[in-house]
């Protein structure tokens, strides 16, 4: 059997096989050693007994999408049945004091591979034997501690495969320079050691995407905006736009990146090399935000122009290869190609509460001689739209430990002047966070307030 017979049906074209060689990967036309690595079809009854105590689940993730030319990393994590884990020696053991369907196990090991490898014979002095090989016959690499690696992972994509010895979690990075753009399929088959052979325990597949567009995302933040994810923002307050470029392999680290903004409000184009920008909308309405990101990235070199055809035959100037035209195209040349990314959003601008201020704090006189609590009036002004709700969060003087939160609807006229009355139990210093809110905005102000003792020697006073 060949690798492509074993590893899935997604067979790319011959063109792909010839032109998209991944560095360090091998063609899936190679032979697969079925004696050492048995192949079971989906639904084969043997899968049921491939692992003691249940089925192992493999989870495959990637940091896709990847800009063509960058590295994409795939990670496989094995999830063992309940109460099982991998120990420091790579053996699979039962977790202490963990009870599964079978109850507590007397044997601490699910798989004691250390014991197996110590018992195994037929090895030469290098620790190499005929069974310490991958499905294509290549020997296992002898990294320090390789004996504690008891899982064999076979990655398969684009008609090629990559084999890796590992523990319960492995990562593989692939350079995408030769990968066809668009969605591609990665399939992984996982085997475990079983004496002098291997047993399949899991198969998993995932789609990844290679693109020639820079993957771009923009986060938007505005002070007083109640919900930053609804793309509704407030008039007359700056919005901070922060561009996040998805570049996990740092492919664009040395590129100059330009950001070209159009805010859709007839303020023209704004070009910047900074990933953050502030913009204030001064009108209500719906606006179309457009961003174009441009980066000069490493890329393929264009084919050389054909040499000019001489009108007369000229005598050769020297041996072939000494031609200065040929010298200009060295195999490792670093060419740059402009890559672009785009982001578009529709932003709604509405009225909101722009500012809130406490202009006065007054101790309210109580009818009782020495009441247990104090009433404080906060006279509050605001700018912008009419608030509908007031919240006060009363906390300790550091403003960290909340003692009391009270929210209530508020009736405010268009002058936006209101008085908020709150109860303080006992004297001392309090931090008061006061927020005024409406449907779209939430404006905050804070103050420290000193509530006096309630005894005859401590007169009622205004705290400022």
């Amino acid at each position: 059997k060949r690798f492509h017979d074993v590893l899935g049906n997604e067979r790319p074209s011959a063109y792909m096989r010839e032109h998209n060689q991944l560095n360090g990967w091998s063609s899936d036309e190679n032979d697969w050693n079925e004696k050492l690595y048995p192949v079971w079809k989906r639904g084969d009854m043997r899968w049921k007994n491939s692992w003691k105590g249940g089925r192992v689940q493999a989870v495959l993730t990637s940091d896709s999408p990847a800009l063509v030319g960058s590295n994409i990393t795939f990670a496989v994590n094995l999830i063992f049945p309940r109460c099982q884990k991998e120990d420091a020696n790579g053996n699979i053991v039962y977790e202490k004091n963990c009870r599964n369907e079978a109850g507590l196990s007397a044997d601490p090991y699910v798989y004691n591979w250390t014991a197996w490898s110590e018992d195994s014979d037929g090895e030469n002095g290098t620790g190499q034997s005929h069974h310490n090989v991958f499905p294509d016959g290549k020997p296992f690499p002898h990294h320090p501690g390789w004996r504690r690696w008891n899982f064999i992972y076979v990655f398969h994509t684009l008609g090629q495969y990559f084999q890796k010895l590992g523990r319960c979690s492995v990562r593989v990075s692939v350079n995408t320079a030769n990968v066809t753009l668009g969605p591609q399929l990665m399939e992984v088959t996982v085997y475990r050691r079983h004496g002098r052979a291997y047993v399949p325990i899991a198969q998993v597949k995932d789609v990844y995407v290679v693109t020639d567009q820079i993957p771009v995302f923009v986060t938007m933040f505005q002070k007083n905006d109640r919900n930053s994810s609804d793309e509704t923002f407030l008039k007359d307050l700056p919005i901070m736009f922060d561009v996040l470029i998805h570049d996990p392999s740092h492919f664009l680290n040395y590129s100059t990146i330009n950001y070209k903004w159009s805010f859709g409000d007839n303020t023209g184009l704004f070009v910047s090399t900074n990933h953050t920008v502030n913009h204030t909308y001064v009108l209500n309405g719906t606006f179309s935000l457009n961003l174009t990101v441009k980066a000069a990235a490493p890329g393929p070199c264009p084919p050389p122009p054909p040499p000019p055809r001489p009108s007369k035959p000229t005598p050769s100037l020297g041996p072939a290869g000494d031609n200065p035209l040929e010298l200009s195209r060295i195999p490792d040349e670093n060419c740059q190609i402009n890559r672009y990314g785009h982001f578009q959003a529709t932003i709604t601008i509405v009225e909101g509460i722009l500012e809130v201020n406490i202009i006065q704090m007054t101790d309210v006189l109580m009818p009782v001689p020495w009441p247990e609590s104090s009433l404080i009036d906060f006279v509050v002004t605001c700018q912008g739209s009419i608030p509908t709700e007031v919240c006060t969060i009363i906390s300790d003087p550091t403003c960290e430990i909340t003692q009391n939160t009270v929210c209530s609807p508020v009736d405010v006229d268009e002058m936006c002047l209101l008085t908020v009355r709150r109860t303080f139990n006992g004297s001392g210093t309090y931090c008061v966070n006061l927020t005024l809110g409406d449907d779209t905005s939430l404006a905050l102000t804070s103050t420290l307030i000193s509530v006096p003792d309630r005894d005859p020697a401590s007169p009622l006073r205004m705290a400022n």
Epitope: S373, I386, T388, E389, T392, N404, V406, C407, S408, P409, V410, D411, D413, E414, T419, R421, R422, T423, D438, D439, T440
Partner: antibody
């Protein structure tokens, strides 16, 4: 002079629906929260629902949540209460009131009778 | 069962001073303004006191409101026969997210 005039009350069978209206005048309607308060025959006042000036925030009493819907049309200076799945215990005079942290002006009320 | 507790009835003779109490909790009276409403027989309620102790224009200064902790009270001095009515206290309740009323106090002017 502030005026609130309720309409739309009447006799309805249990499970039925009714829509009350409150026409407001004498103040800037679009700038004020509005509320509905009801009073069952011979009983005390019970708050029903409130709505913010723009209509974006709405509050309901637990007894009507999911059955009643408060709304407003600021261009028509009108407050509404859509009452569905009416029950005998919803029988009351329904008052429209201005504001929501205190009710400074009240309409004369409209009687809703739920009976088979 | 009302969230705010009022005595069901109160009475006094003309010229007397009468006080109606209203007790609640920190989530309503304790941290929100109390209002008082007067409902004359067969009419709609009318705002008498707002923000614990403020009188709207047109309300005689015989009516006064006060609050201490989680209790509020309405005082009517120089009682008159036209004060015979039902009186309700009310406040927003921040825990229930609802406006709550007292059960009402029926004030009778004797003589």
């Amino acid at each position: 002079e502030v005026q609130l005039l309720e309409s739309g009350g009447g006799l309805v069978q249990p499970g039925g629906s009714l829509r009350l209206s409150c026409a407001a005048s004498g103040f800037t309607f679009r700038a004020r929260p509005m509320s509905w308060v009801r009073q069952a025959p011979g009983k005390g006042l019970e708050w029903v629902s409130s709505i913010s000036h723009s209509g974006g925030s709405k509050y309901y009493a637990d007894s009507v949540k999911g059955r009643f819907t408060i709304s407003r049309d600021n261009s028509k200076n009108t407050l509404y209460l859509q009452m569905n799945s009416l029950r005998a215990e919803d029988t009351a005079v329904y008052y429209c009131a201005r504001k929501w942290s205190t009710f400074d002006y009240w309409g004369q009320g409209t009687l809703v009778t739920v009976s088979s | 069962q009302s969230v705010l507790t009022q005595p069901p009835s109160a009475s006094g003779t003309p010229g007397q001073r009468v006080t109606i109490s209203c007790s609640g909790s920190s989530s309503n009276i304790g941290n929100n303004y109390v209002s008082w409403y007067q409902q004359l027989p067969g009419t709609a309620p009318k705002l008498l006191i707002y923000a614990d102790s403020q009188r709207p224009s047109g309300v005689p200064d015989r009516f006064s409101g006060s609050k201490s902790g989680t209790s509020a009270s309405l005082a009517i001095s120089g009682l008159r026969s036209e004060d015979e009515a039902d009186y309700y206290c009310g406040a927003w309740d921040s825990s229930l997210n609802a406006y709550v009323f007292g059960g009402g106090t029926k004030l009778t002017v004797l003589g």
